[in-house]
């Protein structure tokens, strides 16, 4: 058993049929010695008396809010949560496996630049009685500070018969140099509590590996005289690290119709313009990627050919 | 310890070209190592990230773009002294800071070159003959060093009398390639910045 926060405790349980469970001793936070009784949740049934209560925690029915009273007055609470371990593996029931970039990916993180600011998100099908808390650091043995905000519900989607909820959190490394060469990864830890179930999820990464620039901005087309070709130009996204001559981007320019199966024109360039062949009903799209360290491509910025 | 915005310098172009080749060569070699040593811990997640130049050179700080010198977090520089004459610097007006930056890059390359050559000598003794260093990568390191053209003491190649542990050597190769790729990215950024300045 360990303390998650004041008056909230996590009991770690090996979860298998007829498991013996864990013996837990609760102590009432009071100077009083006599006349103390214990109850669980909203029940008025007295579970025991005295300053301490010893319980055998085996299942969710044994978890919950234990309260000690004296003469009708509440003295203190202890909330017990369960953390299940099945076949030596901690449960991951609360969050959905996003399977990208690999299986057992519950947290996904992205950074728009090298400033040390990043966003992580996760998915769940649970809509109520759910809380998250996020901690982060650079390195684990001698951790350096990363400050994270509160996790918020950022999107709701319908997937077949199920509703899916996306939560996200923004974090900022306390003293980040955009030009630094990272040798210690960022660690992100998410505590998830659903009713009386506790789970924790972690992710470890270098900012350089989670870079995904915003799409290029200000796409413009200039038809070339006596030609089917157009010159397309664009600018670096505002959110990208500066100076741009140091933090350079490379671009992919594509002309395609509405369907992915349609024929297309595609060219890669380090410049902020390119010449492509435009077709009726097609659109020109441009995306960006760090020129020197190949992490993710940005989403496409698009303009119609016509 | 930073790069002022200098006058356009035709002498930077060869260094830019060589640094681009360097990044391509090390990235290619790292990819090859990851594929060949698929049953060794050779991915970024699996290896320890070591920097053999730590406390010996200060490339990131010495080559910091002017725009980032206002960032307190970028200025925890380590003081290191370097020789200052180089052929990438065509202009007499080249700043002392730029020379410091380029000589730091030169020292990095020299250290990695020695490590790689020592390692390759060991890998050539491996009866499995599983992986060797790409001669192209070694040649590109050499070309960039020549383009930088700094005079510096030659570092003797490490020789080892004991029987090499090939497993450890291959893991060390992965560690070295990952670190060198990161440094090659920095070098490429610096050359691009200097070229545009």
């Amino acid at each position: 058993i360990w303390e998650l926060k004041k008056d909230v405790y996590v009991v770690e349980l090996d979860w298998y049929p007829d498991a013996p469970g864990e013996m837990v001793v609760l102590t009432c936070d009071t100077p009083e010695e006599d006349g103390i009784t214990w109850t669980l949740d909203q029940s008025s049934e007295v579970l025991g008396s005295g300053k301490t209560l010893t319980i055998q925690v085996k299942e969710f029915g044994d978890a919950g809010q234990y309260t000690c009273h004296k003469g009708g007055e509440v003295l203190s609470h202890s909330l017990l949560l369960l953390h299940k371990k099945e076949d030596g593996i901690w449960s991951t029931d609360i969050l959905k496996d996003q399977k990208e970039p690999k299986n057992k990916t519950f947290l996904r993180c992205e950074a728009k630049n090298y400033s040390g600011r990043f966003t992580c998100w996760w998915l769940t099908t649970i809509s109520t009685d759910l809380t998250f808390s996020v901690k982060s650091s650079r390195g684990s043995s001698d951790p350096q500070g990363v400050t994270c905000g509160a996790a918020t519900l950022s999107a709701e989607r319908v997937r077949g018969d199920n509703k899916e909820y996306e939560y996200s959190v923004e974090c900022q490394e306390d003293s980040a140099c955009p030009a630094a060469e990272e040798s210690l990864p960022i660690e992100v830890m998410v505590d998830a509590v659903h009713k009386l179930k506790y789970e924790n999820y972690t992710s470890s990464f270098f900012i350089r590996d989670i870079i995904k620039p915003d799409p290029p901005k200000n796409l413009q087309l200039k038809p070339l005289k006596n030609s089917r070709q157009v010159e397309v130009s664009w600018e670096y996204p505002d959110t990208w690290s500066t100076p741009h001559s140091y933090f350079s981007l490379t671009f992919c320019v594509q002309v395609q119709g509405k369907s992915k199966r349609e024929k297309k024109d595609r060219v890669f360039t380090d410049k902020t313009s390119a010449t492509v062949i435009c077709r009726k009903n097609a659109s020109i799209s441009v995306r960006a990627q760090d020129r020197y360290y190949s992490s993710s491509w940005s989403e496409w910025a698009s303009v119609p050919c016509s | 310890r930073n790069l002022p915005v200098a006058t356009p310098d035709p002498g930077m172009f060869p260094c830019l070209h060589h640094s681009q080749n360097l990044l391509r060569a090390v990235s290619n070699m790292l990819q090859k190592a990851r594929q060949t040593l698929e049953f060794y811990p050779c991915t970024s997640e699996e290896i320890d990230h070591e920097d053999i130049t730590k406390d010996k050179t200060s490339t990131v700080e010495a080559c910091l773009p002017l725009e980032l010198t206002k960032n307190e977090s970028c200025l925890n520089s380590r003081e290191t002294s370097f020789i200052t004459n180089g052929s990438c610097l065509a202009s007499r007006k080249t700043s002392f800071m730029m020379a410091l930056c380029l000589s730091s890059i030169y020292e990095d390359l020299k250290m990695y070159q020695v490590e790689f050559k020592t390692m390759n000598a060991k890998l050539l003794m491996d009866p499995k003959r599983q992986i060797f260093l790409d001669q192209n990568m070694l040649a590109v390191i050499d070309e960039l060093m020549q383009a930088l053209n700094f005079n510096s003491e030659t570092v003797p190649q490490k020789s080892s009398l004991e029987e090499p542990d090939f497993y450890k050597t291959k893991i060390k190769l992965c560690i070295l390639l990952h670190a060198f790729r990161i440094r090659a990215v920095t070098i490429d950024r610096v050359m691009s910045y200097l070229n545009a300045s």
């Epitope: 199966r261 024929k263 024109d265 595609r266 | -």
Partner: antibody
Framework: EVQLQQSGADLVRSGASIKLSCTAS????????MHWVKQRPEQGLEWIGW????????EYAPKFQGKATMTADTSSNTAYLQLSSLTSEDTAVYYC???????????WGAGTTVTVSS | DIVLTQSPATLSVTPGDSVSLSCRAS??????LHWYQQKSHESPRLLIK???QSISGIPSRFSGYGSGTDFTLSINSVETEDFGRYFC?????????FGAGTKLELK
């Protein structure tokens, strides 16, 4: 299966014209760009140009402007290359290509050998 | 027009050798470079697109890398079926152009 059937080898007199054909099977040429590439005996490859059969748009390499004319007939699923004022320099194998992407060649025909005699 | 220079013109190798073929562009072409193999009396076939992207059905011993002006096609452990000519082609701008080719022959 995506395939390109090119017309047979031809021997033509200097100064004459010739029209080569390239018939597609397994796909509709409207969904592809069609290119023509020239290869002279024991030499490299030269790009002649492309046509978009969907709308008839064409682009030629400057060297072949006036020498080559590309057309396409979507009803017969065939692309054509007409070469005019033939000289010995035009003796070559001519390949047609069907490309989902405009700028590289993923489906090649077997080629048509054209020999120009004086 | 963009000129592509391939080297060497001829490469004599023994099956099992690993080889690198070079293609250099007269100006920077990013990664807009593709590699083709042409065996005797056959049409060319696409091996690698955009400098390093593999093509389905092409053996994994073929790999490409490079960007800007310098490109390399590597064949890891040459097999007898690999002998023939290799061409690079740029798609950075029109007109599309090819290199003169490298002939890979049996030593």
């Amino acid at each position: 299966e995506v395939q390109l059937q090119q017309s047979g080898a031809d021997l033509v007199r200097s100064g004459a014209s010739i029209k080569l054909s390239c018939t597609a099977s397994g796909f509709n040429i409207k969904d592809y760009y069609m290119h023509w590439v020239k290869q002279r005996p024991e030499q490299g490859l030269e790009w002649i140009g492309w046509i978009d059969p969907e709308n008839g748009d064409t682009e030629y390499a400057p060297k072949f402007q006036g020498k080559a004319t590309m057309t396409a007939d979507t009803s017969s699923n065939t692309a054509y290359l007409q070469l005019s004022s033939l000289t010995s320099e035009d003796t070559a194998v001519y390949y047609c290509n069907a490309c989902k992407e405009l700028r590289y060649f993923d489906v090649w025909g077997a080629g048509t050998t054209v020999t120009v005699s004086s | 027009d963009i000129v592509l220079t391939q080297s060497p013109a001829t490469l004599s190798v023994t099956p099992g050798d690993s080889v690198s073929l070079s293609c250099r562009a007269s100006q920077s072409i990013s990664i807009n470079l593709h590699w083709y193999q042409q065996k005797s009396h056959e049409s060319p076939r696409l091996l690698i697109k955009f400098a390093s992207q593999s093509i389905s059905g092409i053996p994994s011993r073929f790999s490409g890398y490079g960007s800007g002006t310098d490109f390399t096609l590597s064949i890891n452990s040459v097999e007898t079926e690999d002998f023939g000519r290799y061409f690079c082609q740029q798609s950075n701008s029109f007109p599309l152009t090819f290199g003169a080719g490298t002939k890979l022959e049996l030593k």
